[in-house]
C-alpha cells in the first residue's frame, strides 16, 4: 500500500527524498541548521516517521523550529546589548558584553561578542560558551590628580575622588580591658582587597611574637572623604587578616599585609583600586614623586564614634595628602645609621621626604599608599605604604619617611588574593 | 643601643602627685608596647600595667586601677607614669620596660619617696 | 592572678659549680598559640633587672650560654651550669600568659 506524498517541514528535509512511499518505508525529518525539530512541543534533532500497511503515515510531519540561546547569563560587574532588532536571542543573533566603564575593564580585551550557536548556547571565538570577566580599572581616579611638577609643603585638601583607593582602617579590640583601639591606613587593590602594614594589624599584646590582630576587630572604611560625614562611605568587615610571615617587629622588614573584606565593595567614583606595581626589586627610582594621603589620626583617645562621625580631636577632618621625592637609598641608611639607635633601613624599605624635614614626612597614616604615576600605563601605582620613620619623629631635619617597597612583594600579595599573575595582566603596571 | 632613660628621683608630701618619664631610643618606638613595674624597698617585682605605643590605649593590673595614669609622647618617643594622691606605700623605684609582655629592656629606675 | 613560686629562696654557690632555680606557675602558661611566655630576668644589686631568657628556653643575645631554661606547663627551671662572680644578684622568673602579668618572689644568689 502506497502512503500519501511528504511535504518536508519549513527549515528542513526528509530522508530519503523518494517519489513514492510503500509499506514499511521510514523517512528521517531533520531541520537545517540552526533549527531543531518541534514534536509535541519537544524540541529533538531528528524525528522518523513509518508508512504503515494502511497507506498512512505513524506521525504527523513535524516543524522546524529556530533554535533559541535564551535570555544570555549576566555578567557581574557588566552589561549587555543586543545587536538584533526586538533583542532577538535566536540562531545567529548577536549580543555583545560590556563592562561597568570607567571601573571595570574586560579581561584581555576579549570584544565581548557572543553569536546565538545552532547547539543554542552563546559563543565567543575566544572564550567559547565562558562568559568574559570584568576586572576592577586600577590607578585611574575620576578626578586628575594635580601635577607632580610643583612641590607642596604640608598638606593639601584632596578633592572626593581624587584618591579613591584611600582606606580607613579601624581596629578595636573589645578583647581588651579596657578596648583597645587604633587606627591605620590602606589601599583598596580590587573589590575585596585591601593592601596595608603590617604593623596596622598587628596586636601589640605580644612583643615577643607577631600576632595579627582577630578579623571581628577590623573594620574598613572606603570611599570616605570627610572623617565628619560617613553617610558616603562604604564601611566592610573583614573575612581575612593576613600579615606578611616575615614580619620583623624589630625593625618593620616587611612590613606588609592584607585584609580580605567579608563582601566586595561596590566600585565607583570615589571606590576604585590603585594599581600594583610590576615586580622590580629596585622600587622606585630616587628623586621621582610620588602622593602620600592620609587623616592623620593619632590621637589616642578618640573613639572610633568620633573619628567615624564627628572627627574630633583628629589632625584633619577631610583627606590629606602631600608630596615627596623618594630618597637615593643610600642617603637615607646613612641619614638613619648616623642616629642613635639600631635602625636598619633594608633592602624592602625606600625613603622619601625631604632633607630639611617638615610635616610633609609624617603626614599620612601608618599603611598608607605611597602612589607614583606610571607614564607608560597612564595609571596610578602603589609603590610604597607608609611604615615607620616620619610619624615618630616629625619634622626632624633629614629624617624620611620609611616606606615598604610593595614591587617586592607583588608575587605574595597576587598569591594571598589567589589570583594567578596571568589573569591580572591589566592591572599591573606596564 | 636600645635604651630607656628615666626621669630622676622624686621626693613627694602625701597627697600630692608625681609624674615619671621614660624616654626611650634606638629603636622603632611604635612596635612596642612598654610596661611599668613597681619594686618597693627591700621587696620583689610588681608589674603595674602597660600602654600600647601604638594606640595609646593603657592596661592596668588590677592594684593600679584609680590613682596611676599610663599616658604617651608620641613625638619624643616618651611614656609617663603619673601617680596622684601619694601614699607612704607608693614609695618604691619605678622601672618601665620595653614590651606589653616581653619586657626585654629595663630603664634605670626612678626611686619616688613619698614622705612627709 | 597566676602565683608564681620560686625555690630557694636564697643560694650560695662555689664559683664553677653549676646552680638550679625552680619556678612553679599556678596553672599552665601554654597560651592559645601554642607558646609559653615564662621568662627569667636577673637584677644586680643597684641595678635595673635585665632580661635573660624568654619563651622558656631562649636566651637573650649577649647572654653567656652557660644559662640555659628549660620546662612546660607549669614546671620550670633555670640552670647555671657554671656560675661566675657577676652572676651574683637576684633572679625572678614571671609569666605573661595571664594577665595580669605576675613575677616570682626572687631568688638571691650568692658567691661562696
Known amino acids: 500500500n502506497e502512503c500519501p506524498e511528504l511535504q518536508p517541514p519549513v527549515h528542513g528535509k526528509i530522508e530519503p527524498s523518494q517519489a513514492k512511499y510503500f509499506f514499511k518505508d521510514q523517512v528521517l525529518v531533520s531541520c537545517d541548521t540552526g533549527y531543531k525539530v518541534l514534536k509535541d512541543n519537544v524540541e529533538m534533532d531528528t524525528f522518523q516517521i513509518e508508512c504503515l500497511k494502511d497507506g498512512t503515515w505513524s506521525n504527523k510531519i513535524p516543524t522546524c523550529k529556530i533554535v533559541d540561546c535564551r535570555a544570555p547569563g549576566e555578567l557581574e560587574h557588566g552589561l549587555i546589548t543586543f545587536s538584533t532588532r526586538n533583542n532577538l536571542t535566536t540562531y545567529k543573533s548577536e549580543i555583545k558584553y560590556s563592562c561597568q566603564e570607567p571601573y571595570y575593564k574586560m579581561l584581555n580585551n576579549n570584544t565581548g561578542i557572543y553569536t546565538c550557536s545552532a547547539q543554542g548556547v552563546w559563543m565567543n571565538k575566544v572564550l567559547g560558551r565562558s562568559l568574559p570577566t570584568c576586572l576592577p580599572e586600577c590607578g585611574q581616579p575620576s578626578r586628575s590628580l594635580p601635577s607632580l611638577v610643583k612641590r607642596i609643603i604640608g598638606g593639601r585638601n584632596a578633592e572626593p575622588g581624587l584618591f579613591p583607593w584611600q582606606a580607613l582602617i579601624v581596629v578595636e579590640d573589645t578583647s581588651r580591658v579596657p578596648n583597645d583601639k587604633w587606627f591605620g591606613s590602606g589601599a583598596l587593590l580590587s573589590a575585596s582587597w585591601i593592601l596595608t602594614a603590617a604593623h596596622v594589624l598587628r596586636s601589640q599584646r605580644r612583643d615577643t611574637t607577631v600576632i595579627p590582630v582577630s578579623k571581628e576587630h577590623v573594620t574598613v572604611y572606603l570611599g570616605l572623604h570627610d572623617v565628619r560625614d560617613k553617610s558616603g562611605a562604604v564601611n566592610s568587615s573583614a573575612a581575612r587578616v593576613v600579615l606578611h610571615p616575615d614580619f620583623n617587629i624589630q625593625n618593620y622588614n616587611h612590613d606588609i599585609a592584607l585584609v580580605q573584606l567579608q563582601e566586595p565593595v561596590p566600585l565607583g567614583p570615589h571606590v576604585m583600586p590603585v594599581c600594583l606595581p610590576r615586580l622590580e626589586p629596585e622600587g622606585p627610582a630616587p628623586h621621582m614623586l610620588g602622593l602620600v594621603a592620609g587623616w592623620g589620626i593619632s590621637n589616642p583617645n578618640v573613639t572610633v564614634d568620633e573619628i567615624i562621625s564627628s572627627g574630633t580631636r583628629t589632625l584633619s577632618d577631610v583627606l590629606q595628602y602631600v608630596k615627596l621625592p623618594v630618597v637615593p637609598h643610600a642617603e637615607c641608611k646613612t641619614s638613619y645609621e648616623s642616629r642613635s639607635g639600631n635602625y636598619s633601613v633594608t633592602e624592602n624599605m625606600f625613603c622619601a621626604g625631604y632633607y630639611e624635614g617638615g610635616k610633609d614626612t609624617c603626614l599620612g597614616d601608618s599603611g598608607g599608599a605611597f602612589v607614583i604615576f606610571d607614564d607608560l600605563s597612564q595609571r596610578w601605582v602603589v609603590q610604597g605604604l607608609v611604615s615607620w620613620g616620619g610619624p615618630e619623629e616629625c619634622g626632624s631635619k633629614q629624617v624620611y619617611g620609611v616606606y615598604t617597597k610593595v614591587s617586592n612583594y607583588v608575587d605574595w600579595v597576587w598569591e594571598q588574593m589567589g589570583l594567578p599573575q596571568s589573569v591580572v595582566e591589566p592591572q599591573v603596571e606596564r | 643601643q636600645i635604651q630607656l632613660v628615666q626621669s630622676g628621683s622624686e621626693l613627694k608630701k602625701p597627697g600630692a602627685s608625681v609624674k615619671v618619664s621614660c624616654k626611650a631610643s634606638?629603636?622603632?618606638?611604635?612596635?612596642?608596647?612598654m610596661s611599668w613595674v613597681r619594686q618597693a624597698p627591700g621587696k620583689g617585682l610588681k608589674w603595674m600595667g602597660w600602654?600600647?605605643?601604638?594606640?595609646?590605649?593603657?592596661t592596668y593590673a588590677d592594684d593600679f586601677k584609680g590613682r596611676f595614669v599610663f599616658s604617651l609622647d608620641t613625638s619624643v618617643r616618651t611614656p609617663y607614669l603619673q601617680i596622684s594622691s601619694l601614699k607612704a606605700e607608693d614609695t618604691a623605684v619605678y622601672f618601665c620596660a620595653r614590651g606589653g609582655e616581653a619586657m626585654d629592656y629595663w630603664g634605670q629606675g626612678t626611686l619616688v619617696t613619698v614622705s612627709s | 592572678d597566676v602565683l608564681m613560686t620560686q625555690t630557694p629562696l636564697s643560694l650560695s654557690v662555689t664559683p664553677g659549680q653549676p646552680a638550679s632555680i625552680s619556678c612553679k606557675s599556678s596553672q599552665s602558661l601554654l597560651d592559645s598559640d601554642g607558646k609559653t611566655y615564662l621568662n627569667w630576668l636577673l637584677q644586680r644589686p643597684g641595678q635595673s633587672p635585665k632580661r635573660l631568657i624568654y619563651l622558656v628556653s631562649k636566651l637573650d643575645s649577649g647572654v653567656p650560654d652557660r644559662f640555659s631554661g628549660s620546662g612546660s606547663g607549669t614546671d620550670f627551671t633555670l640552670k647555671i651550669s657554671r656560675v661566675e662572680a657577676e652572676d651574683v644578684g637576684v633572679y625572678y622568673c614571671w609569666q605573661g600568659t595571664h594577665f595580669p602579668w605576675t613575677f616570682g618572689q626572687g631568688t638571691k644568689v650568692e658567691i661562696k
Open positions: 600602654i600600647n605605643t601604638y594606640s595609646g590605649v593603657p
Open positions: 634606638g629603636y622603632i618606638f611604635t612596635s612596642y608596647g
